[in-house]
Interface confidence: low
Amino acid sequence: VPRWRQQWSGPGTTKRFPETVLARCVKYTEIHPEMRHVDCQSVWDAFKGAFISKHPCNITEEDYQPLMKLGTQTVPCNKILLWSRIKDLAHQFTQVQRDMFTLEDTLLGYLADDLTWCGEFNTSKINYQSCPDWRKDCSNNPVSVFWKTVSRRFAEAACDVVHVMLNGSRSKIFDKNSTFGSVEVHNLQPEKVQTLEAWVIHGGREDSRDLCQDPTIKELESIISKRNIQFSCKNIYRPDKFLQCVKNPEDSSCTSEI
């Protein structure tokens, strides 16, 4: 008789999740000399310990503390790029602009990027069939709590000018319910962060509107200003050209507005 298993609304744990996490850890620590001391076995043990045998709707930030401790990493606090709903371009940017970092350029972000995971209460099994959906099932699920934890720590570490890339093609360019809007914005430290600079990425080639005047951007400006952090905003009308100019800043066509 097959054992009864909780059916959740979201997709199950990513296939070969343990191996993927460990392979990524080994790869990351090989590529980043400053993280060579990290023992990937310990990292996996801590990652697993955060959710295995625990109810997948009852995960806390505390569960992830051993993993956070092992993954402690110093990135230049004035070179942080946050993003919301435009991950691919943000990652393309930091691949070119190597001195800037998204969360996924850190060890912990790199380990978990695009993965799903959850366990089951009182068993050591990983649930490959289904995992809780943030909206339909519960918010305190292993994946959501992980990203909330690492995002909070990433934002807390930021200083000077912090950049955020926002998707100008979405109805809510700034979404208070996104990780950026609900976690990162509120964890920037006013005593360390001078300015939050938003880069609004345009989607249409002919779109010449000033999306920095969008009501949601004004809402972001208000939230940031109330936290005693300055706010600035730039339109990136041509993201393709923007990336090209980051690669080749001397190009004559890059001196004009992008």
Epitope: E19, L22, A23, C25, V26, D39, C40, Q41, D45, S124
Partner: antibody
Framework: EVQLLESGGGLVQPGGSLRLSCAAS????????MSWVRQAPGKGLEWVSD????????HYVDSVKGQFTISRDNSKNTLYLQMNSLRAEDTAVYYC????????????????WGQGTLVTVSS | QSVLTQPPSASGTPGQRVTISCSGS????????VSWYQQLPGTAPKLLIY???QRPSGVPDRFSGSKSGTSASLAISGLRSEDEADYYC???????????FGGGTKLTVL
């Protein structure tokens, strides 16, 4: 509870072959790298070979390269050591040991051991 | 000849503190973690210390590990008669792409 049970040892003539097995239970076998470690009578421990979680990586001590083959069947939760061209100096208790989840060299240690199986090579 | 060097024997009286050394090179202890195992007579080895100084659950805090450069040490405080056993250090050797053990130290409780 993690359990490792070795079998397949015995008396064999020089030049002969044996296949050792290690049946694993109490953990997700295909999450872990596995090793064979041997101990000659009255001597110390000697690492023999290890294999990664999926069998994709294998390593051997120089003295058994080309002679021993480590393998695993994750569907059967079993580790194997095929030993050919056996010599008197291969006489030892052979232990199966659970290593790390991914063959991460810097953290490689043996958290669990079987009770061992004795291989005697003698004419 | 073992890659890691341990004294063949050590001894102490009950209640004493005993230290067992393990010497290696940059390609093993210098670059990688050290583990320690206890082997009671007629039994399989048991993990005592891993990652230089970590104790698995169930191992008394009388056992402690440390490492400096290319050498490691296992300390046993409050020595007991049941500690009489063989003790082995182990590390990974990057140049050999495999694990290496010390020759073992026979601990006698007098």
């Amino acid at each position: 509870e993690v359990q490792l049970l070795e079998s397949g040892g015995g008396l064999v003539q020089p030049g002969g072959s044996l296949r050792l097995s290690c049946a694993a239970s109490g953990f997700t076998f295909d999450d872990y790298g596995m090793s064979w470690v041997r101990q000659a009578p009255g001597k110390g421990l000697e690492w023999v070979s290890d294999i990664s979680w999926n069998g994709g990586k294998t390593h051997y001590v120089d003295s058994v390269k080309g002679q021993f083959t480590i393998s695993r069947d994750n569907s059967k939760n079993t580790l194997y050591l095929q030993m050919n061209s056996l010599r008197a100096e291969d006489t030892a208790v052979y232990y199966c040991a659970r290593g790390s989840l991914f063959h991460d060299s810097s953290g490689f240690y043996f958290g669990h051991w079987g009770q061992g199986t004795l291989v005697t090579v003698s004419s | 000849q073992s890659v890691l060097t341990q004294p063949p024997s050590a001894s102490g009286t009950p209640g004493q503190r005993v230290t067992i050394s393990c010497s290696g090179s940059s390609s093993n202890i210098g670059d990688n973690y050290v583990s320690w195992y206890q082997q009671l007579p007629g039994t399989a080895p048991k993990l005592l210390i891993y990652r230089d100084s970590q104790r698995p659950s169930g191992v008394p805090d009388r056992f402690s590990g440390s490492k400096s450069g290319t050498s490691a040490s296992l300390a046993i405080s409050g020595l007991r008669s049941e500690d009489e056993a063989d003790y082995y250090c182990q590390s990974y050797d990057s140049s050999l792409s495999g694990s290496v053990f010390g020759g073992g130290t026979k601990l006698t409780v007098l």
